[in-house]
């Protein structure tokens, strides 16, 4: 189906900036300085192509993307079908983070990339460091007390934990939007299931200690797993849609060369460790440092702390999908009684996890839906 | 100087048997893992086996049941037992061992290979 690719897109080449300027959106780049020293670049589309003369403030959404994902996710499709510039024509204030280990997010102060130390993080930073960070800067720089936060995949992982254990942070979150939420992996059907077969002691003699590349390691599961299924030599050698899956009926096609360009955007192999230990132990908790003592060093307790989404009181909407392989309908179904303010939840029956980001009837199974949920906001 | 070597590959016909042996000199630390690696003329270098000091192992499923990794921690040795040997087996055996003083300075450490013909 898509053996070949014709490389037809420019943005192939183009880092966030020019993504967004070479559709005719208006484009603010910072640098965000996290406590630990991780310079995340950040995006701001703070209007729209036709709403540039409206003055006041206008509502701030800020979108986290997924897991092997970058802030590319949320533009990668033709500005009619890609959430960012929906949202900035519909007047909103947008803003793209970018999780530390990604290609927009590969510098620290104090450690080189090509160290260990600066790999040596999961999830649970990026909850702690990145999104405070993140949220405080974009809070300052519009003068604004709230924003409505959207997350898809590990984005809504890094807004559970982060507005369940920091209180100030979730008083900034209007409205928690979450696109195929991951919490719990106990059911996952992703192919991220086989990790678990890595014994604690080989995964960093198999995948190294710095950066996440699964090499060849997933080639034995691919020929029967994956690839048999009318694809596609293509999406069979990339991360991203390997851990994923991927949907070829929704799938346009021709931005193929767009998506495949842009991911994975990398993640550490810690990180990567992190959600084998969820799916083995089928909870929402911290890192395992692998012994007693140092689980202690790091937690003041023997054992990781879990993470107790009751505790997160943001008004969040459900978005999920019937064929989601990594958030699976199991787990969103044990995370759903969970959420003590739940004001909206959909199952789209035929989504896969990254349709949410890319389908191209995304706008009208999902998008439409959080521009008027934030416009109903507004009154 | 950490150095790996490698030895036992020979050609032997389909169905047979050969063990690989791989000894580490030269190290003032006891590597935390160990493995086999091959490679094929022409693509990439892929696992094969590999084994813990604390003795968890981890097989491809492509020898699982048919091969075995074993290792001898105060040596800093370890084996590959490869049995029912299939042409397809046949490449270039590389060990690998991966350890350091901290874990801030692990490294991975290769041998030279050695080949494994398995003809039919």
């Known amino acids: 189906l898509f053996g070949k690719l014709h490389p037809g897109s420019p943005e192939v080449t183009m880092n966030i900036s020019q993504m967004i300027t070479y559709w005719g959106y208006p484009n603010e780049e910072y640098e965000v300085v996290t406590e630990d020293g991780y310079i995340l670049e950040v995006n701001r589309i703070p209007y729209g192509k036709k709403n540039s003369g409206n003055t006041g403030q206008r509502p701030v959404v800020f979108l986290q993307h997924g897991l092997l994902a970058s802030a590319t996710n949320w533009i990668s499709n033709l500005p009619n079908n890609s959430l960012a510039f929906i949202l900035a024509d519909a007047g909103y204030d947008v803003w793209l983070g970018n999780s530390r280990g990604n290609t927009w997010a590969r510098r620290n102060l104090y450690y080189s990339p090509d160290s260990v130390e600066f790999w040596a993080f999961s999830f649970d930073e990026m909850a702690k460091y990145d999104l405070p960070a993140t949220i405080d800067f974009i809070v300052k720089k519009t003068g604004q007390k709230q924003l409505h936060y959207v997350g898809h995949s590990q984005g809504t992982t890094i807004g559970f934990i982060a507005f369940s254990t920091n209180p100030s942070l979730a008083k900034r979150i209007k409205t928690f939007y979450a696109l195929a939420p991951v919490a719990t992996v106990k059911y996952t059907k992703s192919l991220i299931n086989k990790l678990r077969f890595v014994p604690q002691s080989l995964f960093k003699f198999i995948f190294g200690d710095k950066i996440f590349y699964p090499h060849n390691f997933f080639d034995q599961f691919l020929a029967t797993e994956v690839c048999s299924r009318e694809m596609l030599n293509l999406l069979c050698s990339n991360a991203l849609f390997i851990i994923c899956g991927f949907d070829s009926k929704n799938f346009n096609t021709s931005r193929l060369d767009v998506y495949l360009s842009h991911n994975p955007a990398g993640t550490s192999v810690q990180n990567m460790f992190h959600w084998t230990q969820a799916v083995k132990s089928g909870k929402f908790q911290a890192y395992d440092w692998g012994s007693p003592v140092q689980n202690r060093m790091h937690y003041d307790q023997s054992q990781p702390p879990y993470y107790n989404v009751t505790a997160m009181n943001v008004p969040i909407a459900v978005w999920n999908g019937g064929k989601d392989l990594l958030a699976d309908p199991q787990d969103v179904g044990l995370l759903l009684p969970k959420l003590p303010n739940l004001i909206y939840h959909k199952e789209i029956p035929f989504y896969n996890h990254l349709d949410f980001i890319w389908a191209m009837d995304a706008p009208q199974e999902v998008y439409n839906d959080i521009v008027s949920m934030i416009s109903e906001d507004k009154k | 100087q950490v150095q790996l070597q490698e030895s036992g590959g020979d050609l032997v016909q389909a169905g047979g048997s050969l063990r690989l042996a791989c000894a580490a000199s030269g190290s003032t630390f006891s590597f935390n893992a160990m493995g086999w690696y091959r490679q094929v003329p022409g693509k990439q270098r892929e696992l094969v086996a590999a084994i813990g000091n604390d003795g968890s192992t981890y097989y491809v499923n492509s020898v699982k049941g048919r091969f075995t990794i074993s290792r001898e921690n105060a040596k800093n040795t370890v084996y590959l037992q490869m049995n029912s040997l299939k042409p397809e087996d046949t490449a270039v055996y590389y060990c690998?061992?991966?350890?350091?003083?901290?874990?801030?300075?692990?490294?991975?450490?290769w041998g030279q290979g050695t080949q494994v013909t398995v003809s039919s």
């Open positions: 690998k061992g991966r350890g350091g003083l901290t874990q801030y300075s692990e490294h991975d450490y």
